[in-house]
Interface confidence: low
């Protein structure tokens, strides 16, 4: 492979290497790695590889997610499980004998212990394990609102199954307002899709460790199955050093034109057709706000610079860990224009044309 | 601003300029700019500059699309409406005294007129106007499937509002299911959200065009405001150069870790936490396959070179436009780790960590 | 941490004109609605008006109803208020606040408010 | 008159549970709508205390709270203190108004 100068594939590797190296400490906010003294020997704990495994299955059954990250989500997330409340409690009584739906409980203090802020919240997925079904039925989730009232949330249509599945909704933005009240029970109702029309209204979907028990739940012994709350947080101590002087910038509009940074930013740039590039045949707009991305994007070596203070810069300067980074767009916009071929005049949208942000890459 | 060599800012300027040139005849599918010769005197017509300002009010309220972009969404969009059938049509007769919904039909063969060919269709939406409004309810979006079946499609939660609104539908999926289709009328129910509980199902939101007449409705004369179908589709002409043998590859691992591109491409690297960083620390995984993004992005000078072979590298070297593009990763995932801080493991997600396609930005 | 200045206020004679600005940082200005709220001396608070986060709605009390205007610029992350035809009941200190959420018309910062005296 | 109305003035020792109430109708209140209630010390701009009608704002002490029922909503303030002496107001946007948002009258708390 050759751009202008040959390029040493291995030196590329090395770097990359290396980038990576710093890029992982730098997302844990630790100057090296931690030690290892005190861990116990043996294989890992069954709840602890369940827990990345569930983890693992969520990035596996997700597409990527190329949005433009605030400060805080470039750094590492601790994943943690809270449990709905047991079925035993009391709270259920009045819920026994509705056939529309399930109803699930949580405890907003153990939701707590797991996010002891809001804003530290990253992301909360309900989780529930439904089981084999032959039937396909539109079903709904929602959130208690009040005393007696239920907040719609989404809804989904389950397709019938051999095998029991996992169903996650996100629910993140409830679990931070749950956060944001006092401690008490909050909770969930998980309903069939209720017609206007129809008659029959009940839910034929079974959810495992709430639905009435049948051979083949699986280990709901072990309580691994039955529904729960996963939740994502940047722990407390590396929520400290979010907002201190050194913190990520949007190098968007708002940020690079009013400042004279050197480094990676969007860069002013007006497109008049007539006058820059002698077209009159666009009739609208008369130009547009094109902008580009100019400024260097420093490689940082790990290595000989094991500080904390320097990791803190790959955040700004080189998050993806890149051999060589490179300053280029991040959110970009489409615009529409209107032309005319032959007497039609036809309007078009051209994706992609307006420079936003940028980003080193 | 300096990287490794002074930059001069009215160059970088100039050959954004230029590459906007070459870009914008590019993404028309244009050798040249179209001779004005045939352009009627006077302003646009009036339908043509509404249908420019929805498209244009569309793009304000969205927020950018970041998304790997297929090859034909690189290409610009000829916008279209469909007003629906007339509401004096007889097919609406079985629908007048329904409560809970109000219908819309359409005729496929106006579709097809606009859209010729289903795969053409980039983007269809269901454009509706809600008259003011003091309640707030929950509305759903259904499609006529067979005789008497509807299938669901979509919801919304509509807030009280002083002044009529537009609501927006995303129905790509099924105008393109339309156009597979014979000719014939199809439909949409616009409904409320029926509760298993509530004995009141009935839809007050109120739509322009439909509704029974107040005072107030908007510019019904025109029939600007009765819902329609907004289309964006390739144009037939522009869509032949699609299946050409120079087309846009996608930069992901199944291209690039199979073939020997030369240039800009995803590259394979496996971190092996052990061998590769010499570390111990991280219990799960072992490693992970981080890949890497390198190979050049020809700079394309469109002044020089105004032919459609030059043009058609655009797509594949420069979609953005850029006055130095760079070789930079597009879809990126995350990786869940599993360590332990003292005697506590801990399960954490790390974002961005893995380079699953690259692209020249 | 989230701040909201307003400016541009002053003694003006009735039937005049005042332009009020208030500059915001601190969040992306351009993902919320934003408010002018006043308060008459001794009086309670008074909703004036609202703009939606792109600029495309505007809501005006009765009052104020094609004497006031109100825009914004999301590059500047300005707010702006533009009041013609002013009376002696518009004397008030005039605060922009931002909505919670988009447009939830509950206001989580204040300005810390600008006079307006119309008085000849 | 304002639409949502509130008592002008209430008094309460240190200590005390106050609740100062606000009273509206179907087309605010009782529709549903976002309610919020705000404190306003002298000389300052006011602050979000409550919002949706139960939900404390962010660095708001838990001796404040908020509830609803029907068109009357109800701020309580347990613990009393005397830095809560200021004006309290309820807000909440208005369907039936061609304004949108009203306020309460306001309520001046004095602690004694």
């Known amino acids: 492979l050759s751009t202008c100068k040959t390029i040493d594939m291995e030196l590329v590797k090395r770097k990359r290497i290396e980038a990576i190296r710093g890029q992982i400490l730098s997302k844990l906010r630790l100057a090296s790695p931690p030690s290892q003294g005190e861990v116990p020997p043996g294989p890992l704990p069954e709840a602890v590889l369940a827990l990345y495994n569930s983890t693992r299955d969520r990035v596996a059954g997700e597409s990527a997610d190329p949005e433009p990250e605030p400060e805080a989500d470039y750094y590492a997330k601790e994943v943690t499980r809270v449990l709905m409340v047991d079925r035993n409690n009391a709270i259920y009584e009045k819920t026994k004998d509705i056939s529309h739906s399930i109803y699930m409980f949580f405890n907003t203090s153990d939701i707590r212990e797991a996010v002891p802020e809001p804003p530290l919240l990253s992301r909360a997925e309900l989780r529930l394990q439904r089981l084999k079904s032959s039937v396909e039925q539109h079903v709904e989730l929602y959130q208690k609102y009040s005393n007696n009232s239920w907040r719609y949330l989404g809804n989904r249509l389950l397709t019938p199954t051999d095998t029991p599945e996992w169903l996650s909704f996100d629910v993140t933005g409830v679990v931070r307002a749950w956060l944001n009240q006092g401690d008490g029970i909050q909770g969930f109702r998980f309903s069939a899709h209720c017609s206007c029309d129809s008659k029959d209204n009940k839910l034929h979907v079974e959810i495992n460790g709430i639905s009435p028990k049948r051979r083949g739940d699986l280990g709901t012994i072990h309580d691994m199955n039955r529904p729960f709350l996963l939740l994502m947080a940047t722990p407390l101590e590396r929520a400290q050093h979010l907002h201190s002087s050194r913190h990520r910038r949007a190098l968007d509009t708002n940020y690079c034109f009013s400042s004279t940074e050197k480094n990676c930013c969007v860069r002013q740039l007006y497109i008049d057709f007539r006058k820059d590039l002698g077209w009159k045949w666009i009739h609208e707009p008369k130009g547009y706000h094109a902008n580009f991305c100019l400024g260097p994007c420093p490689y940082i070596w790990s290595l000989d610079t094991q500080y904390s203070k320097v990791l803190a810069l790959y955040n700004q300067h080189n998050p993806g860990a890149s051999a060589s980074p490179c300053c280029v767009p991040q959110a970009l916009e489409p615009l529409p224009i209107v032309y005319y071929v032959g007497r039609k005049p036809k309007v078009e949208q051209l994706s992609n044309m307006i420079v936003r942000s940028c980003k080193c890459s | 601003l300096s990287t490794c060599k002074t930059i001069d800012m009215e160059l970088v300027k100039r050959k954004r300029i230029e590459a906007i040139r070459g870009q914008i005849l590019s993404k028309l599918r244009l050798a040249s700019p179209p001779s004005q010769g045939e352009v009627p005197p006077g302003p646009l017509p009036e339908a043509v500059l509404a249908l420019y300002n929805s498209t244009r009010d569309r793009v304000a309220g969205e927020s950018a699309d970041p998304e790997p972009e297929p090859e034909a969404d690189y290409y610009a969009k000829e916008v279209t409406r469909v007003l629906m059938v007339d509401r004096n049509n007889a097919i609406y007769e079985k629908t007048k005294d329904i409560s809970h919904s109000i219908y819309m039909f359409f005729n496929t063969s106006d579709i097809r007129e606009a859209v010729p060919e289903p795969p053409l269709l980039s983007r269809a939406e269901l454009r509706l106007q809600r008259l003011k409004s003091s309640v707030e309810q929950h509305v759903e979006l259904y499609q006529k499937y067979s005789n008497n079946s509807w299938r669901y499609l979509g919801n919304r939660l509509l807030t009280p509002t002083d002044t009529p609104e537009w609501l927006s539908f995303d129905v790509t999926g099924v105008v393109r299911a339309w156009l597979n289709q014979g000719d014939g009328i199809q439909g949409f129910r616009f409904s409320a959200h029926c509760s298993c509980d509530s004995k009141d199902n009935k839809l007050h939101v109120e739509i322009n065009g439909i509704s029974p007449k107040r005072r107030g409705d908007l510019g019904t004369i025109h029939d600007m405001n009765r819902p329609f179908l907004l289309l964006m589709a390739t144009p037939l002409e522009r869509a032949q150069h699609l299946h050409s043998s120079r087309h846009r590859r996608a930069l992901d691992t199944n291209y690039c870790f199979s073939s020997t591109e030369k240039n800009c491409c995803v590259r394979q690297l496996y971190i092996d936490f052990r061998k590769d960083l010499g570390w111990k620390w991280i219990h799960e995984p072992k490693g992970y396959h981080a890949n890497f993004c390198l190979g050049p992005c020809p700079y394309i000078w469109s002044l020089d070179t105004q032919y459609s072979k030059v043009l058609a590298l655009y797509n594949q070297h420069n979609p953005g436009a850029s006055a130095s593009p760079c070789c930079v990763p597009q879809a990126l995932e995350p990786l869940p780790i599993v360590y332990y801080v003292g005697r506590k493991p801990k399960v954490e997600q790390l974002s961005n960590m893995i380079v699953r396609s690259c692209k020249c930005s | 941490e989230v701040q909201l200045v307003e400016s541009g206020g002053g003694l003006v004679q009735p039937g005049g004109s005042l332009r009020l600005s208030c500059a915001a940082s601190?969040?992306?200005?351009?993902?919320?609605?934003v408010h002018w709220v006043r308060q008459a001396p001794g009086k309670g608070l008074e909703w004036v008006s609202h703009?939606?986060?792109?600029?495309?709605?505007?809501y005006y009390a009765d009052a104020v109803k094609g004497r006031f205007t109100m825009s914004r610029d999301n590059g500047k992350n300005t707010l702006y208020l533009q009041m013609n035809g002013l009376k002696s009941e518009d004397t008030a200190v005039y605060y922009c606040?931002?909505?919670?959420?988009?447009?939830?018309?509950?206001?989580?910062?204040w300005g810390q408010g600008t006079q307006v005296t119309v008085s000849s | 008159l304002p639409v949502l109305t509130q008592l002008s003035s209430m008094s309460g020792s240190p200590g005390q549970t106050v609740t100062i109430t606000c009273t509206g109708s179907?087309?605010?209140?009782?529709?549903?709508?976002?309610l919020s209630w705000y404190q306003q010390l002298p000389g300052t701009a006011p602050k979000l205390l409550i919002y949706n009608a139960n939900n404390r704002a962010s660095g708001v002490p838990n001796r404040f709270s908020g509830s609803k029922s029907g068109n009357l909503a109800s701020l309580t303030i347990t613990g009393l203190q005397a830095e809560d002496e200021a004006d309290y107001y309820c807000?909440?946007?208005?369907?039936?108004?061609?304004?949108?948002?009203?306020f309460g009258g306001g309520t001046k708390l004095t602690v004694l």
């Open positions: 606040a931002k909505d919670r959420i988009r447009s939830s018309y509950e206001y989580d910062s």
């Open positions: 807000g909440c946007y208005d369907s039936s108004l061609s304004t949108g948002y009203v």
């Open positions: 601190g969040f992306t200005f351009s993902n919320y609605g």
């Open positions: 703009i939606s986060a792109a600029g495309i709605s505007r």
């Open positions: 179907s087309s605010n209140i009782g529709g549903g709508y976002y």
